[in-house]
Interface confidence: low
């Protein structure tokens, strides 16, 4: 399907005469009849097999014909055809004189013909206009013509139908040669197949629209390349779905039993060395200058109470500095300018003169110490913390820092081993003198009831079409991971072939 376009450009009839030589009165009011037909070696009268078209009166005698295409006018003249363009044609253009307004052939006198031209030849489809000029003894006609394809038709002879679409049946535009050009994100013969997100796993992922990646059962992640481990798997991984392979240092069915607290939690601070001492139990060996269960407390140089005579110690970047009370001086406030007359003994201490009054000594009441009875006796001296707890002086009180497994103000209480619910799958926990014991429900065994003894749901090979079967341990059921091209809970249904193209 296409259009033969004829653009009349200029008609010259300087003398204003008819083909018979008779002049027009008052001038030749000229219109044209065009006949387009199949190729004839000698163009002869007969049916205009490709179509006909007539113009209104375009001018008198000699005139140029205005390009009226943009305004929807009649120049170029349009001769549509609904067949494959054969590449050859015959064209007859007649110029007629219209004495009146009726331009029908039967309404015109037979000698109203001004001129007639007939051409034939080859013409390929294309945008280029072929310019031609035909001259007779009295007239000259300049015109150009071309053949172009109708909308949605393409190819060298306008025989290729292609209509862009973006729906269920295809997502494409048409190339200049009529072939399909898929819209971004689509592929396939008719551009019906979406291109999944780049990197989407071929077997484990699929998509229903471009740049999507939907995961098949048992797979996850942006590209569906990560298997989903067993439900409840804490510190384990999988290489196929529903596995739970424990990371190093973890044990149990769900890999939730910590066998390496040091590595997993790094509890020891400030460069201390950590040693595992049982499940969730550890010991920190502190570097010099640090203390505390986790070596989290920095041993200040002031902790050794270097300032004497009631001096206050202030930490510095490197070392400490003593702020001395009145009457004392020196690096540690060790030098005194006082005597008993200055009442230097605090907290009810008694002053005794020495060296003929040049010096003194304080005798302190119970719970106080120091050269001026200025210090309370260290509350940690008696080590009140039980079970290896560490005593810390903190402000006006003391505090016991307990080792793992103990609690209470003085670390006197033993934490139950069963408090952590260590028995899996509903096992019953019993505290013993040296640890614990699990009583397992039916179907489970092992020290922590972590071993499953029930049947394997995949044993009966329930999956079709070479699908992979996985057992869901928590429900005793199976899951089939279908290969590409199959769906269904057992992968029993082939994916439907794409529907035939609707043209």
């Amino acid at each position: 399907s296409g259009v033969f376009q004829l653009q009349l450009q200029e008609f010259i009839n300087e003398r204003g005469v008819l083909a018979s030589g008779r002049p027009c009165e008052p001038g030749c009011r000229t219109f044209f009849r065009v006949c387009l037909k199949h190729f004839q070696a000698v163009v002869s009268p007969g049916p205009c097999t490709f179509g006909t078209v007539s113009t209104p009166v375009l001018g008198t005698n000699s005139f140029a014909v205005r390009d009226d295409s943009s305004g929807g006018g009649r120049n170029p003249l349009q001769l549509p055809f609904n067949f494959t363009w054969p590449g050859t044609f015959s064209l007859i253009i007649e110029a007629w004189h219209a004495p009146g307004d009726d331009l029908r052939p039967e309404a015109l006198p037979p000698d109203a013909l001004i001129s007639k031209i007939a051409i034939q030849g080859s013409l390929a489809v294309g945008q280029n206009w072929l310019l031609d000029e035909q001259t007779s003894t009295l007239t000259r006609l300049r015109y150009s013509y071309r053949v172009i394809c109708s909308d949605n038709y393409y190819g060298d002879n306008c025989s290729r139908l292609c209509k862009k679409r973006n729906d269920h049946f295809g997502h494409y535009v048409c190339q200049p040669d009529g072939n399909l050009s898929c819209l971004p994100g689509w592929t396939g013969e008719y551009c019906q197949q979406p291109i999944c997100l780049s990197g989407c796993h071929e077997q484990n992922g699929y998509c229903s629209k471009p740049a999507e990646c939907l995961c098949r059962p048992g797979w996850q992640g942006r590209l569906c390349n990560e298997c989903i481990p067993h439900n409840g798997c804490r510190h384990g991984t999988c290489s196929t779905p529903w596995q739970c392979t424990c990371d190093e240092g973890w044990g149990g069915l769900f890999c939730d039993q910590d066998l390496n607290y040091c590595t997993h939690h790094s509890p020891c601070k400030n460069g201390a060395t950590c040693s595992n001492s049982g499940q969730r139990s550890y010991t920190c060996t502190c570097r010099p200058g640090y203390t505390g269960v986790d070596c989290e407390l920095e041993l200040s140089e002031c902790d050794s109470n270097p300032c004497r005579n009631g001096g206050s110690c202030k930490d510095q970047e490197d070392g400490y500095h003593c702020l001395c009370p009145p009457g004392y001086y020196g690096l540690h406030c060790e030098h005194s300018t006082l005597s008993c007359a200055d009442s230097p003994c605090f907290n009810g201490g008694s002053c005794r003169e020495r060296n003929q009054g040049a010096n003194y000594a304080c005798e302190c009441p119970p719970n106080f110490t120091g050269s001026n009875c200025e210090k309370k006796v260290d509350r940690c001296t008696s080590n009140p913390c039980a079970n290896g707890g560490q005593c810390l002086n903190r402000g006006p009180s003391r505090m016991c820092r307990c080792r793992p497994g103990f609690t209470g103000t003085y670390c006197e209480l033993h934490v139950s081993d069963c408090a952590r619910n260590p028995c899996a799958h509903g096992g019953t926990c019993h505290d013993l003198e040296n640890g614990l014991m699990c009583t397992c429900p039916a179907g489970f065994s092992g020290r922590r009831c972590e071993v499953r003894t029930s049947i394997d749901a995949c044993a009966s090979s329930p999956c079709f079409n070479r699908a992979t079967c996985y057992t869901d341990l928590s429900t005793d059921t199976f899951v089939c991971n279908c290969p590409y091209g199959f769906v269904g809970s057992r992968c029993e249904f082939p994916v439907g072939l794409p529907p035939s193209f609707p043209w």
Partner: antibody
Framework: QVQLVQSGAEVKKPGASVKVSCKAS????????MHWVRQAPGQGLEWMGI????????SYAQKFQGRVTMTRDTSTSTVYMELSSLRSEDTAVYYC???????????????WGQGTLVTVSS | EIVLTQSPATLSLSPGERATLSCRAS??????LAWYQQKPGQAPRLLIY???NRATGIPARFSGSGSGTDFTLTISSLEPEDFAVYYC??????????FGQGTKVEIK
């Protein structure tokens, strides 16, 4: 990515012909129309013509009709523009430009060659 | 053929200022108009197509408007790299594809 690489600069005498090539890569060669646009020194852009690489059909600006010939070689994904009867006013940079295709046949030029300087001098 | 007339021929502005370039068509081109930027020694670069759509990778400071016969390219705040020659081009009525004569945006 789409690339259009043109042949090197040419110096020609008046009356001679010049043939400039434009090699396309990074896309399906036959799926996009190719245009030629020229630019005289210090002047604006002037459209010369278009070629359909699929069938080899062309359309030329009226000004160049009879002097310009655009061809293509699908085996090498190359289009050619030959301009004959050169005169001094044909001294210009000649660009090939790929037409961006959509449902309408005439679109814009997103991808251009680097340009080929043709100097016409006696 | 459709003639595109650009104004002004030269626009002298400082970085940070707003640039407004005009393109007028001799007859309606609907919204089928594009804008290109060209720097010395380089091929043109497509900025705007179909009057108001930014081409891939073009910064948001470039915007186009208009339809029919009157079109405008606006650069909201000139960057140093925006000083160049700008051409409009129509695809409404072809052949030929026609370009405007260009507007040079220079540093004041």
């Amino acid at each position: 990515q789409v690339q259009l690489v043109q042949s090197g600069a040419e110096v020609k005498k008046p009356g001679a012909s010049v043939k400039v090539s434009c090699k396309a890569s990074g896309y399906t060669f036959t799926s996009y129309y190719m245009h030629w646009v020229r630019q005289a020194p210090g002047q604006g852009l002037e459209w010369m013509g278009i070629i359909n690489p699929s069938g080899g059909s062309t359309s030329y600006a009226q000004k160049f009709q009879g002097r310009v010939t655009m061809t293509r070689d699908t085996s090498t994904s190359t289009v050619y523009m030959e301009l004959s009867s050169l005169r001094s006013e044909d001294t210009a940079v000649y660009y090939c430009a790929r037409e961006e295709y959509s449902s309408r046949s005439a679109e814009y030029f997103q991808h251009w060659g680097q340009g080929t300087l043709v100097t016409v001098s006696s | 053929e459709i003639v595109l007339t650009q104004s002004p021929a030269t626009l002298s502005l400082s970085p940070g200022e707003r640039a407004t370039l005009s393109c007028r068509a001799s007859q309606s081109v609907s919204s089928y108009l594009a804008w290109y930027q060209q720097k010395p020694g380089q091929a043109p670069r497509l900025l705007i197509y179909d009057a108001s759509n930014r081409a891939t990778g073009i910064p948001a400071r470039f915007s186009g408007s208009g339809s029919g016969t009157d079109f405008t390219l606006t650069i909201s705040s000139l960057e140093p790299e925006d000083f160049a020659v700008y051409y409009c081009q129509q695809r409404s009525n072809w052949p030929p594809w026609t370009f405007g004569q260009g507007t040079k945006v220079e540093i004041k």
